[in-house]
Interface confidence: low
């Protein structure tokens, strides 16, 4: 089962933009100039029933 | 049917750069990444960077400071630009990219372009 | 990095042998394992990813097995087709990174 997309950080992006994404997808996260990022910078939709993320979103800070 | 096709220069002089083009058909670049690959006899095979559907990138921390990795959508083409090439960046390069927008494994490839460094 | 060790360079086969290749991990990699066959003058050709699924195409003689920092590629009933060089590539972290390949050898 796939992953249910997570929210870009404030001040910050996330890639790829999708909403779904297949088990065994990386999600990769990247702060604007200034800010630092905090958390892991690639997660995984780790397969199951239903599949995970492998780690909680990433936040931005200045 | 999803093809990678390169073009770039064979001979590079050191200290110079390197670019190569990655064009791409059976799929949109708006929803798929593209990697770059390379090999040679003495590193083997080494993960270069990719630059997402999205458009963001990644890079190899080793190479970072050297690489750029662009696209042009609506050609359908990557390219991939190195900076200050020394004799020990002699080696094959590889465009790829998997079966959706998030793997880091490698489904389709290019048919690779021989690098050689050397004055 | 993770580091990945392909413990043989070269192993020497029999046609219509089976062939065990190993891979072992630096950490642990939770089966985000791809294998790759290169032949003299092409691209790698993936034949497995998730560790264990084999992709469209490849004949049912390959198999993927493992888990943790261990996986292994077997070939049963060898053909002269798959007298290649294999490798092993994690992508549980990034950068991906590969094995130094085990090339096959006719004996």
């Known amino acids: 089962k796939p992953c249910h997309g997570l929210s870009a950080p404030e001040n910050g992006a996330r890639s790829p933009e999708k909403q779904l994404h297949p088990a065994g997808a990386t999600i990769h996260f990247s702060c604007a100039p200034g800010y630092v990022l905090k958390g892991q910078a690639s997660i995984k939709c780790v397969p199951g029933h239903p599949s995970h993320w492998s780690d909680p979103p990433p936040i931005c800070r200045a | 049917q999803v093809q990678l096709k390169q073009s770039g220069p064979g001979l590079v002089a050191p200290s110079q750069s390197l670019s190569i083009t990655c064009t791409v058909s059976?799929?949109?670049?708006?929803?798929?990444?593209v990697d770059w690959v390379r090999q040679s006899p003495g590193k083997g095979l080494e993960w270069l960077g990719v630059i997402w559907g999205g458009g963001s990138t990644n890079y190899n921390s080793a190479l970072k400071s050297r690489l750029s990795i662009t696209k042009d959508n609506s050609k359908s083409q990557v390219f991939l630009k190195m900076n200050s090439l020394q004799t020990d960046d002699t080696a094959m390069y590889y465009c790829?990219?998997?079966?959706?927008?998030?793997?880091?494994?490698?489904?389709?490839w290019g048919q690779g372009t021989l690098v050689t460094v050397s004055a | 990095d993770i580091q990945m060790t392909q413990s043989s360079s070269y192993l020497s086969v029999s046609l219509g042998g089976r062939v065990t290749i190993t891979c072992k991990a630096s950490?642990?990699?939770?089966?985000?394992l791809a294998w790759y066959q290169q032949k003299p003058g092409n691209a790698p050709r993936l034949l497995i990813s998730?560790?264990?699924s084999l992709e469209t195409g490849v004949p049912s003689r390959f198999s993927g097995s493992g888990s943790g920092k261990d996986y292994t590629l077997s070939i049963t009933s060898l053909q002269t087709e798959d007298v290649a060089t294999y490798y092993c590539?994690?992508?549980?972290?990034?950068?991906?990174?590969f094995g130094a390949g085990t090339k096959l050898e006719l004996k």
């Open positions: 059976g799929f949109s670049l708006t929803s798929y990444g």
């Open positions: 590539q994690q992508y549980w972290s990034t950068p991906p990174t």
């Open positions: 790829a990219s998997g079966d959706y927008d998030g793997s880091l494994w490698f489904a389709y």
């Open positions: 950490d642990h990699i939770n089966n985000w």
């Open positions: 998730g560790a264990t």
